[in-house]
């Protein structure tokens, strides 16, 4: 099985003299699971929320962002263990007194039905069936994501 880098280089060889439009990430890397236009990676250890956030960035990814209820359900369908909780990229902003995604946007109150309090040092976890507010210091697993996003790629002929 070719890696996405190998696949990319084959494409480049085949279209040397063209300007092409091609996804930055053609396929999910090995060990990642594809869910629509995202690649997900589930941790096999536990961490507080901030360590989880940092660990995802070592994989050139971010903690999971969930757009809507539909995406939540599809993500939960990938969780095989009933009682396991996973951090996602949503925590409580004390200054704005609201749930804030790590990309800076705020939670649309209709998107997730959160069990627990919205208060300082609270972060959001998901399980197979629910969404919970937990102390950010709680040590649980986490989910990283990479987006499959198209980028313009200019390929120049050999000089």
């Amino acid at each position: 099985q070719k890696s996405s880098i190998e696949k990319c280089s084959v494409d480049i060889q085949q279209s040397r003299n063209k300007t092409t439009e091609r996804p930055g990430l053609l396929n999910c890397p090995i060990y990642w699971q594809q869910l629509r236009e995202k690649c997900l990676l589930f941790s096999h250890t536990v961490n507080p929320w901030n360590n989880s956030l940092a660990d995802c960035s070592t994989k050139e990814s971010s903690l999971l962002l969930i757009r809507d209820k539909d995406e939540l359900i599809h993500t939960q369908n990938l969780i095989r263990d009933k009682a396991i909780l996973f951090w996602i990229g949503l925590n409580f902003s004390l200054s704005e007194k609201n749930w804030k995604w790590i990309n800076g946007s705020f939670l649309n109150s209709n998107d997730l039905e959160i069990r627990g309090d919205a208060k300082e040092n609270s972060c959001i976890s998901i399980s197979q069936t629910s969404v919970y507010s937990e102390y950010c210091s709680t040590e649980i697993r986490w989910i990283c994501q990479k987006e499959l996003t198209p980028v313009r790629n200019k390929v120049y002929p050999d000089s």
Partner: antibody, heavy 120, light 107 residues
């Protein structure tokens, strides 16, 4: 080179507790999660749980949840596994094993094993 | 819990033989399967991860394949040092489980 060196054999009476240590060297101790796996005489392998040495976070196999405690001392790069209320069927070789990757469940390095015998 | 059933439990073979060990899972585990080798009185040694990826330093005569519920470990040409017990393990769920082992003996 990576090495996990465990404490010596123990003989315990039923109802007692045992604490096994696992000293890591040759890598950054806080960079890899430590697991504990046991093997009863002539039997297969049974996963007991894990500890993240960086944060101290633990996750235990439900079977052992009420009896096992995993701790670590980062200053001496050592992980510990304590099993309480010992029974005769806890007689086994106990191994510490390093999780090879935060995102996959394989064990790339193992300790030499500690034999725990539970007998009255 | 996901059960892993290894077959055969015992296998007699000669140096130079090609041997195959099977591991069957009670549920789909994707490719989250590991193979270990264990010699008497020693700790297990990692051979293969993700069903088919050889660990650093593992000889090329060891290969793994399979996905879903059926997995195989093949040793293409047995060497004297390969006589040992082999275990499969799954990590598709967070309750990691192991197969019962296959003891490979000299014929």
């Amino acid at each position: 080179q990576v090495q996990l060196v465990q404490s010596g054999a123990e003989v315990k009476k039923p109802g007692a507790s045992v604490k096994v240590s696992c000293k890591a060297s040759g890598y950054t101790f806080t960079g890899y999660t430590m697991n504990w796996v046991r093997q009863a005489p002539g039997q297969g392998l049974e996963w007991m749980g894990l500890i993240n040495p960086s944060s101290g976070g633990t996750y235990y196999n439900q079977k052992f949840k009420d009896r096992v405690t995993m701790t670590r001392d980062t200053s001496i790069s050592t992980a510990y596994m304590e099993l309480s209320r010992l029974r005769s069927d806890d007689t086994a070789v106990y191994y510490c094993a390093r999780l090879g990757d935060n995102y996959r469940g394989y064990f790339d390095y193992w300790g030499q094993g500690t034999t725990v015998t539970v007998s009255s | 819990d996901i059960q892993l059933t290894q077959s055969p439990s015992f296998l007699s073979a000669s140096v130079g033989d090609r041997v195959t060990i099977t591991c069957k899972a009670s549920q789909d585990v994707g490719t989250a399967v590991v193979w270990y080798q264990q010699k008497p009185g020693k700790a297990p040694k990692l051979l293969i991860d993700w069903a088919s990826i050889r660990h650093t330093g593992v000889p090329s005569r060891f290969s793994g394949s399979g996905s879903g519920t059926e997995f195989t470990l093949t040793i293409s040409s047995l060497q004297p040092e390969d006589f040992a017990t082999y275990y499969c393990q799954q990590y598709s769920t967070y309750l990691y489980t192991f197969g019962g082992g296959t003891k490979l003996e000299i014929k």
